[in-house]
Interface confidence: low
């Protein structure tokens, strides 16, 4: 029987991090960084940070907006760090309110 | 439920500068824009200024340079520098948290300005 | 900076009536429109986010409506726990402006 392949170390990327799940933290290490919308309450709730399971990301950035959640996914250090995503309807967060989020 | 706490001087005389301050409480700090919002005896809003929790700010250009708001995240508090205060500042002073709407206020600081 | 403008900046109606605020801005704020309640001695209170977004809590008899430059906010039967100045606040630009404010007394 042919021996596995050893698996390669996956590359890390450094992420910018905004939201609760981040608590103190302003970055976050993974395979891939993210940037995301989701409408709460009516409130735009916008978060940033990384995937450390590259499939768990695969799986959410492949899903389209809807008009509740939008996720914008890539690979490379600090690539989210000017990613903000977008809902499909019209719309927009307080000004300058980016990345930020309701708690 | 996030809980704003202010606290400043409420009596100046002409010319002093205005200083208050705001904490929070039970709340994300990087959750919310802080603004500042006054009220004169008698009459309506005006919003003075915002800041996030890395310090970015956004004033109200009516108030020109007078106005500067910073912020402390080790402590949980951001404040209000007024300079070069009149009689036309006499307000009661409010420190909110924002996403698109005003959703937390402070209890309000009467401050007066009275030579 | 945009202008806020309500009207009636006071009325006054019986407990039960129905009652109407408007608000014009001075252009067109795409819909980014929140009203207010403030009672005496206390800090405003939002009740209606994106013209008629009622927050959690607040009670259905109040609702918003409008589009572009126009927007109305109304309480349908207006009971005495309701008396308070009203504000409408828009957020489509800086600096954020509020309207000059409508003060609903009880006839």
């Known amino acids: 029987m042919e021996d596995e392949k050893p698996k390669v170390n996956p590359k890390l990327y450094m992420c910018v991090c905004e939201g609760l799940s981040c608590g103190n933290e302003d970055h976050c290490e993974g395979q891939q960084c993210f940037s995301s919308l989701s409408i709460n309450d009516g409130f735009h709730v916008y978060q940033k940070g990384c995937f450390q399971v590259y499939e768990q990301g695969k799986m959410t950035c492949k899903t389209p907006p809807s008009p509740g959640q939008a996720v914008e996914c890539c690979q490379g250090d600090w690539c989210n760090r000017n990613i903000t995503a977008q809902l499909p309807t019209k719309g927009k967060s307080f000004p300058g309110t980016q990345n930020f989020h309701l708690e | 439920q996030v809980q704003l706490q202010q606290w400043g001087a409420g009596l100046l005389k002409p010319s002093e500068t205005l200083s208050l301050t705001c904490a929070v409480y039970n709340g994300s700090f990087s959750s919310f824009y802080w603004s500042w919002i006054r009220q004169p005896p008698g009459k309506g809003l005006e919003w003075l200024g915002e800041?996030?929790?890395?310090?970015?700010?956004n004033n109200n250009p009516s108030l020109a340079s007078r106005v500067t708001i910073s912020v402390d995240t080790s402590k949980s508090q951001f404040s209000l520098r007024l300079t070069s205060v009149t009689a036309a500042d006499t307000a009661t002073y409010y420190c909110t948290a924002h996403t698109r709407g005003f959703l937390y206020w402070g209890q309000g600081t009467r401050v007066t300005v009275s030579s | 900076d945009i202008q806020m403008t309500q009207s009636p900046s006071s009325l006054s109606a019986s407990v039960g009536d129905r009652v109407t605020i408007t608000c014009q801005a001075s252009q067109d704020i795409n819909n980014y429109l929140n009203w207010y309640q403030q009672k005496p001695g206390q800090a405003p209170n939002l009740l209606i986010y994106?013209?008629?977004n009622l927050l959690p809590g607040v009670p259905s008899r109040f609702s918003g409506s409008g589009s572009g430059t126009d927007f109305s906010f109304t309480i349908s039967s207006l009971q005495p726990e309701d008396i308070a100045t009203y504000y409408c606040q828009h957020y489509d630009d800086l600096p954020l402006t509020f309207g000059g404010g409508t003060t609903v007394a009880i006839r």
């Open positions: 994106d013209v008629f």
């Open positions: 800041i996030n929790h890395r310090g970015r700010t």
